[in-house]
Amino acid sequence: FERTRSLQDPCSNCPAGTFCDNNRNQICSPCPPNSFSSAGGQRTCDICRQCKGVFRTRKECSSTSNAECDCTPGFHCLGAGCSMCEQDCKQGQELTKKGCKDCCFGTFNDQKRGICRPWTNCSLDGKSVLVNGTKERDVVCGPSPADLSPGASSVTPPAPAREPGHSPQ
């Protein structure tokens, strides 16, 4: 079938990085500058994406693959293929539709994106608060209150561990 198709359609022989040029008797021509074809048999090449303004180039366009963009410092990607850049906030803040705003008491954000998350309620798992939460950090839960009876050895608060971070885009 593939052989039959290639006999009927000479364009199917054109590899990625070329296009089937109808103006030149269906000869395979290289993609012009700033364009690409990622699959064979294409009749046109696609225009390369340009990473301008708040977007910056993560991967240059080649004859066989589109450019890939990410965001300049102070912004982060949203959408498939980083279709949008959204401004970062500081840790301890969340981005609302009216801009960055501090986390309310009882919530925190240790990222530069997303919204403020409620502090862990240590008592739900029968534990006590070892280190209080802040706008930037969750509480640290310690042993259950029963474990902290008089005479029990004191517990040294651990250094805050790295909280879950960003997904790679």
Partner: antibody, heavy 120, light 109 residues
Framework: QVQLVQSGAEVKKPGASVKVSCKAS????????MHWVRQAPGQGLEWMGW????????NYAQKFQGRVTMTRDTSISTAYMELSRLRSDDTAVYYC?????????????WGQGTLVTVSS | SYVLTQPPSVSVAPGETARITCGGD??????VHWYQKKPDQAPVLVVY???YRPSGIPERISGSNSGNTATLTLSRVEAGDEADYYC????????????FGGGTQLIIL
């Protein structure tokens, strides 16, 4: 690639407990919060809670507080959800789902689900 | 706690446009996520943070959110789009941070 693989179906009697596991692969387990969501037959999705696999910190929906416990074993990249004092209306498919690295976005990867049937 | 209201079902002919709504008080101030749920399959995130599509989700699926209503739009609907669709938000101010709508069954005529 990211995968969340859950334990198999369970049949339990009312009053018993069930513990469902969710094994993560393809990413750094401690880097992403894990959520649990259930769907009872003919019903919608219901959020149960989350666990921070890094610290073990949890947050449970009030409806489940006192009956649910979420834990993790970082050595085997596995999260657990235990539900106690089971009732017939706890019959549902239970899903684990990964948060994408920051709070406030959608849950980007889901386990295949574990059917828990509560019947006398 | 916060309540999200969805119509139980929406019917549409193949090739037409389906619009599924999700109502909530000042929902425009929140970030809304949409999931597609087919029988015996896990939910799939199709739109996040009001209007962004994860990789692999077709461009004919889009979202919007303002005022008291968020909307998921599926254009050029196909038979494979038949499923339940759920909206979801995070509400940090309540004792139930994860909130789902009741779900909408999309019926392809």
């Amino acid at each position: 690639q990211v995968q969340l693989v859950q334990s198999g179906a369970e049949v339990k009697k009312p009053g018993a407990s069930v513990k469902v596991s969710c094994k993560a692969s393809g990413y750094t387990f401690t880097g992403y919060y894990m959520h649990w969501v259930r769907q009872a037959p003919g019903q919608g999705l219901e959020w149960m809670g989350w666990i921070n696999p890094n610290s073990g910190g949890t947050n449970y929906a009030q409806k489940f507080q006192g009956r649910v416990t979420m834990t993790r074993d970082t050595s085997i990249s596995t999260a657990y959800m235990e539900l106690s004092r089971l009732r017939s209306d706890d019959t549902a498919v239970y899903y684990c789902a990964r948060e994408p690295g920051y709070y406030g976005s959608g849950l980007d990867y889901w386990g295949q689900g574990t059917l828990v049937t509560v019947s006398s | 706690s916060y309540v999200l209201t969805q119509p139980p079902s929406v019917s549409v002919a193949p090739g037409e446009t389906a619009r599924i709504t999700c109502g909530g008080d000042d929902i425009g101030d929140k970030r809304v996520h949409w999931y597609q749920k087919k029988p015996d399959q896990a939910p799939v995130l199709v739109v996040y943070e009001d209007r962004y599509r994860p990789s692999g989700i077709p461009e004919r699926i889009s979202g919007s959110n303002s005022g008291n209503t968020a909307t998921l739009t599926l254009s050029r609907v196909e038979a494979g789009d038949e499923a339940d669709y759920y909206c979801q938000v995070w509400d940090s101010s309540s004792d139930h941070p994860g909130v789902f709508g009741g779900g909408t069954q999309l019926i392809i005529l």
